[in-house]
């Protein structure tokens, strides 16, 4: 197996790799640096493995995961001591290293000059006390969501920056607003931005308005 | 109910070869793998190789390496075991046993009722 | 391949009895560990999975455990149906191996 590559978007975490199998079979193992190597995926002819179930155990822990390639039937292809080839992956530490799932603008309510735009709080894969946690949950106030927002008539665009997941924004009365937003975590060297969110317009379902 | 009902008892010459069936009833043949597991009078178990019904990809333990073949027909759900070379330590009572889904944990949750191989000349 | 050794080879206990058998492995296996029972002309049966998850249908007198690649099984009162031989198996590496057998009887 070669191209090891880890894919995660809020946790979901597949590790996937190449090439496609004739005659071989694949088992997965994973491990943090001080832990087991537990098998996942055994003797599968696929080239992806979900590992989720692993990594949510303790998502600040740095992860590594081997692939080994097993011979179908008759093929002969073992190591010189019989033992079964394998290849490492990449090292993987969740916190640090999963994208972040493009966030949605889950409502918005104006009151005079004033907009309150509310971000949904994500559900991850990640448990506690067996409840699944939000991405807040996970990331308290290392995420930070950044609102991108404009007059329906105009293309200047303002920004936001929260620690939660709400905003108060200003705006001029009598004119129709356009939102995105964006989540954040500044601390990180990669993967610090999600892709933005849809975008939403005041006069939408999502919104309420009030003197 | 789930059962695996394997081939009646077989007696061979060292040299020869031997074949043993497992019919599978009561699930979805494709969603399990089949495991061949092996035991000798009075000794203990043997884990043969593994065989995919789904894409009839197999996997054999290396002390079997070109020796053994594991067969499958997905029309009578039906998987084979082929044991060649046949010898005198090959005696032994032979099991087809189902193991996990490929997300699933390798145990084996059922077992055929064993098939008495003997190899005497 | 990964050696599961068990121990002890036999015992004798008497009904009612806390009967204690244990594997242990080479390497670390994880939790990747299952425990069969076998009588005698009969196929194994699955007890543990996991090391220590009890399979559908097995009474809770037995039980499964882990401390490093040390595993532990336990019948907590021993009962006359109990008398069998019990293996457990690894599934962490290629091979799958079982350990040697603990041939359980009644004093």
């Known amino acids: 197996a070669f191209n090891l590559t880890w894919i995660s978007t809020d946790f979901k975490t597949i590790l996937e790799w190449q090439p496609k199998p004739t005659n071989y079979t694949y088992t997965v193992q994973i491990s943090t640096k001080s832990g087991d190597w537990k098998s996942k995926c055994f003797y599968t002819t696929d080239t992806e493995c979900d590992l989720t179930d692993e990594i949510v155990k303790d998502v600040k822990q740095t992860y590594l995961a081997r692939v080994f390639s097993y011979p179908a039937g008759n093929v002969e292809s073992t190591g010189s001591a019989g033992e079964p080839l394998y290849e490492n992956s990449p090292e993987f530490t969740p916190y640090l290293e999963t994208n972040l799932g493009q966030p949605t603008i889950q409502s918005f309510e104006q009151v005079g000059t004033k907009v309150n735009v509310t971000v949904e709080d994500e559900r991850t894969l990640v448990r506690r006390n067996n409840t699944f946690l939000s991405l807040r949950d996970v990331f308290g106030k290392d995420l930070i969501y950044t609102l991108y927002y404009w007059k329906s008539s105009s293309s200047g665009k303002k920004t936001a920056k929260t620690n939660t997941n709400e905003f108060l924004i200003d705006v001029d009365k009598g004119e129709n607003y356009c939102f995105s937003v964006q989540a954040v975590i500044p601390s990180r060297t990669v993967n610090r931005k999600s892709t933005d969110s849809p975008v939403e317009c005041m006069g939408q379902e999502k919104g309420e308005f009030r003197e | 109910q789930v059962q695996l009902v394997q081939s009646g008892a077989e007696v061979k010459k060292p040299g020869a070869s031997v074949k043993v069936s497992c019919k599978a009833s009561g699930y979805t043949f494709a969603n399990y793998y089949m495991h061949w597991v092996r035991q000798a009078p009075g000794q203990g178990l043997e884990w043969m190789g593994i065989i995919n019904p789904s894409g009839g990809i197999t996997v054999y333990a290396q002390k079997f390496q070109g020796r053994v073949t594991m067969t499958r027909d997905t029309s009578t759900s039906t998987v084979y075991m082929e044991l060649s070379s046949l010898r005198s330590e090959d005696t032994a009572v032979y099991y087809c046993?189902?193991?996990?889904?490929?997300?699933?944990?390798?145990?084996?949750?059922?077992w055929g009722q064993g098939t008495m191989v003997t190899v005497s000349s | 391949d990964i050696q599961m050794t068990q121990s002890p080879s036999s015992l004798s206990a008497s009904v009612g009895d806390r009967v204690t058998i244990t594997c242990q492995a080479s390497?670390?296996?994880?939790?990747?560990l299952n425990w069969y029972q076998q009588k005698p002309g009969k196929a194994p049966k699955l007890l543990i999975y996991?090391?220590?998850n009890l399979e559908t249908g097995v009474p809770s007198r037995f039980s499964g455990s882990r401390s490093g690649t040390d595993f532990t099984f336990t019948i907590s009162s021993l009962q006359p149906e109990d008398i069998a031989t019990y293996y457990c198996?690894?599934?962490?590496?290629?091979?799958?191996?079982f350990g040697g057998g603990t041939k359980v009887e009644i004093k």
């Open positions: 198996q690894q599934y962490n590496f290629h091979p799958l191996t």
């Open positions: 996991d090391a220590s």
């Open positions: 390497q670390d296996i994880s939790n990747s």
């Open positions: 046993a189902r193991g996990g889904s490929k997300v699933a944990a390798l145990a084996f949750d059922i």
